[in-house]
């Protein structure tokens, strides 16, 4: 176990021409915050894919108001580090996404508005316990300068945080074959408890006799690289030569969860859901009371005053599990109505609404027909958050306020001349044609292709189209 730490040094315009406009203004003050998402391995996954190694959100930075006419300076940053705790081994290779978000503080409907200013991503190799690594990334005209490191949480040490340290049993030296734990010289490496032969680089253990593999390695001793060549079956170690994955024991086989815990497979390992009164990676810790602080993520512990009585964790919104250890994937509930796009910022849920919809969850269908009349006898037709006017004859435009030119579409056939009329249009037909749109030829003998023209109307006379 350990913590990935990210320190943002600056965020501002990059070098070169085309400096970006300040994201804040006197009319619309704003402040920045950052989100980091970590994924194991050198994956090139979509930004929306899960942050399997973890994610963190910074505090909000100071409120910033642009000075009129001044170019965008480096913007004021939030205090402190972004910390992403990891429970298992540090994978050594990882992908990151760092997002810079703007929170607008103007008094707009819907509360503070968040918008993504910049997103940078990269793939890096990093050993835990090493020094801070410095980086500069550019996103469009913006430049982000930052440092990062991974450090192990005691008692773990090593480049993957898989070796354990224990206080010295003797004041002067460590036991046979055991080295001091740098930088904790007063502690010694714990005796090796992994399965004999387990790769020190690619394997680790949390229980005596086991050998669990880091991503990209397989085999009973984690010495076989996983092949990317096609395999017939999806899981488990195969021959030690190819490293191809074929069916084998899954991480939940034999149920590693003690005390009635239920096991579920995760992309990299397994996870135990423990019954009340037990916790730990394998539900192995028991006799827990509220005094032990078993509720994570700000959960409220109730009951459990002594080890024999169960405690109950009342989880804060966004967390679940008997110890509030699991984050609820709020976007999986598809909370954004009417085709809105969901974004879980950690501290809040945001929906990006399709045109025609508004509200925190895109629940507000912008019904433009309400209180909006179509002029000149037109009727309003709603649909999908938009509206249109179906105009009466002779009128057009968005609100039927414009007089339509009925002749614009050249409605008179066979060279007939069109005349606009208050009730529509009139066609004056060329010789040899008749009908409201001059659509019927007049036969040489004077008969038409239709029944005779109405009394009093000679072929060639203008016909009014009503």
């Amino acid at each position: 176990a350990g913590v990935f730490e990210l320190q943002i040094h600056s965020f501002g315009p990059g070098p070169g021409p085309g400096a970006p406009r300040s994201p804040c203004s006197a009319r619309l003050p704003c402040r920045l915050f950052f989100r980091v998402c970590l994924k194991p391995g050198l994956s090139e996954e979509a930004a929306e894919s899960p942050c399997a190694l973890g994610a963190a959100l910074s505090a909000r930075g100071p409120v910033y108001t642009e000075q009129p006419g001044a170019p965008a300076p480096d913007l004021p940053l939030p205090d402190g580090l972004l910390q992403v705790p990891f429970r298992d081994a540090w994978p050594g290779t990882f992908s990151f996404i760092i997002e810079t978000w703007r929170e607008e503080l103007g008094d707009q409907i819907g509360g503070p508005a968040w918008s993504l200013l910049a997103r940078v991503a990269g793939r890096r190799r990093l050993a835990a316990g090493g020094p801070w690594a410095r980086d500069i990334q550019r996103a469009g005209a913006w430049e982000l300068r930052f440092s990062y490191r991974a450090r192990c949480e005691p008692p773990a040490v090593g480049t993957a945080c898989t070796r354990l340290c224990r206080p010295r049993s003797a004041p002067s030296r460590c036991g046979p074959g055991l080295r001091p734990c740098a930088p904790l010289e007063d502690e010694c490496e714990a005796p090796l408890v992994c399965r004999a032969g387990c790769s020190p680089e690619h394997g680790f253990c949390e229980q005596p006799g086991e050998c669990r593999c880091l991503e990209g390695w397989t085999g009973p001793l984690c010495t076989v690289p996983v092949s990317t060549s096609s395999c017939l079956s999806p899981r488990g170690p195969s021959s030690a030569t190819t490293g191809c994955l074929v069916p084998g024991p899954g991480p939940c086989d034999g149920n590693p969860c003690a005390n009635g815990g239920s096991c579920s497979e995760t992309p990299r390992s397994f996870e135990c859901t423990c019954p009340r009164g037990f916790y730990g990676l394998r539900c192995e810790v028991s006799g827990v009371t509220c005094a032990d602080g078993p509720c994570f993520n700000g959960g409220l512990c109730v009951g459990g005053a002594d080890p024999d009585s169960a405690y109950i964790c009342h989880c804060p919104p966004g967390f679940q599990g008997s110890n509030c250890e699991k984050r609820v994937d709020r976007c999986s509930l598809q909370p954004c109505r009417n085709g809105g796009l969901c974004l879980d910022l950690g501290h809040a849920l945001r929906c990006r609404c399709r045109a025609g919809f508004a509200g925190p969850r895109c629940e507000h269908d912008l019904d433009d027909c309400a209180g909006r009349a179509c002029a000149n006898g037109g009727t309003c037709v709603e649909g999908g958050g938009a509206h249109r006017c179906s105009c009466a004859l002779g009128f057009g435009g968005r609100d039927c306020r414009e007089r339509a030119d009925p002749c614009a579409a050249r409605p008179c056939a066979h060279g007939g001349r069109c005349y606009a009329h208050f009730s529509g249009l009139v066609c004056a037909c060329a010789p040899g044609y008749m009908g409201a749109r001059c659509e019927f030829p007049v036969h040489p003998d004077g008969a038409s292709a239709l029944p005779a023209a109405p009394p009093g109307l000679r072929p060639g006379d203008p016909q009014r189209y009503l």
Partner: antibody, heavy 121, light 107 residues
Framework: EVQLVESGGGLVKPGGSLKLSCAAS????????IHWVRQAPEKGLEWVAY????????YYADTVKGRFTISRDNAKNTLFLQMTSLRSEDTAMYYC??????????????WGQGTSVTVSS | DIQMTQTTSSLSASLGDRVTISCRAS??????LNWYQQKPDGTVKLLIY???RLHSGVPSRFSGSGSGTDYSLTISNLDQEDIATYFC?????????FGGGTKLDIK
């Protein structure tokens, strides 16, 4: 325990005004949106108005738009409904109800016991 | 506005019966459907949200199902304390609308 207690109801003449209050306890008031819902005698439930946790988002039913104003005081854990230009059809039991956290479902998960409003000359 | 229709306005059943109350929306509400119970004294409680999720403290004999425009509330083993009026409510699009209610009593 989540508790919502409405007050301020009573008898008022048509065209008159009334201000309802809803006192909240047992939860972090400023984390939740709150609704007003009413029920006319022998009728069903009718949603009236909603205000988001920070007071930024406010919605009204068309039947009360322009006459009713919803507001909240997070420091005092209190919700208000200012009703003006009252009509006989506004006669109902008025309930305040807590919205769900994050407004994912737009549920009303806890309700008060209601306060009665009668509009009559 | 989305209209919510509860076709059965009243229903009589015996203790221990399985009772189903239906609710229809005038258009797809994408499972944002909640059920409430109103006791004769006026007390209102949320039973089920998002079509099928049981609100905390609600007995497991209550269940919900449905999708699109058609939804139902089922009480699997009718108890005396279930005598009440049941309302559905859509939380998909403003304004939030309720069904007319189904009054349940004991035969």
């Amino acid at each position: 325990e989540v508790q919502l207690v409405e007050s301020g109801g009573g008898l008022v003449k048509p065209g008159g005004s009334l201000k309802l209050s809803c006192a909240a306890s047992g939860f972090t008031f400023s984390d939740y949106g709150i609704h007003w819902v009413r029920q006319a005698p022998e009728k069903g439930l009718e949603w009236v108005a909603y205000i988001s946790s920070g007071g930024y988002t406010i919605y009204y039913a068309d039947t009360v738009k322009g006459r009713f104003t919803i507001s909240r005081d997070n420091a005092k854990n209190t919700l208000f409904l200012q009703m003006t230009s009252l009509r006989s059809e506004d006669t109902a039991m008025y309930y305040c109800a807590r919205g769900d956290y994050d407004d994912i479902f737009y549920t009303m998960d806890y309700w008060g016991q209601g306060t009665s409003v009668t509009v009559s000359s | 506005d989305i209209q919510m229709t509860q076709t059965t306005s009243s229903l009589s059943a015996s203790l221990g019966d399985r009772v189903t109350i239906s609710c229809r929306a005038s258009r797809d509400i994408t499972k944002f459907l909640n059920w409430y119970q109103q006791k004769p004294d006026g007390t209102v409680k949320l039973l089920i949200y998002y079509t099928s999720r049981l609100h905390s403290g609600v007995p497991s004999r209550f269940s919900g199902s449905g999708s699109g425009t058609d939804y139902s509330l089922t009480i699997s083993n009718l108890d005396q304390e279930d005598i009440a009026t049941y309302f559905c409510q859509q939380g998909n699009t403003l304004p939030w609308t309720f069904g007319g209610g189904t009054k349940l009593d004991i035969k």
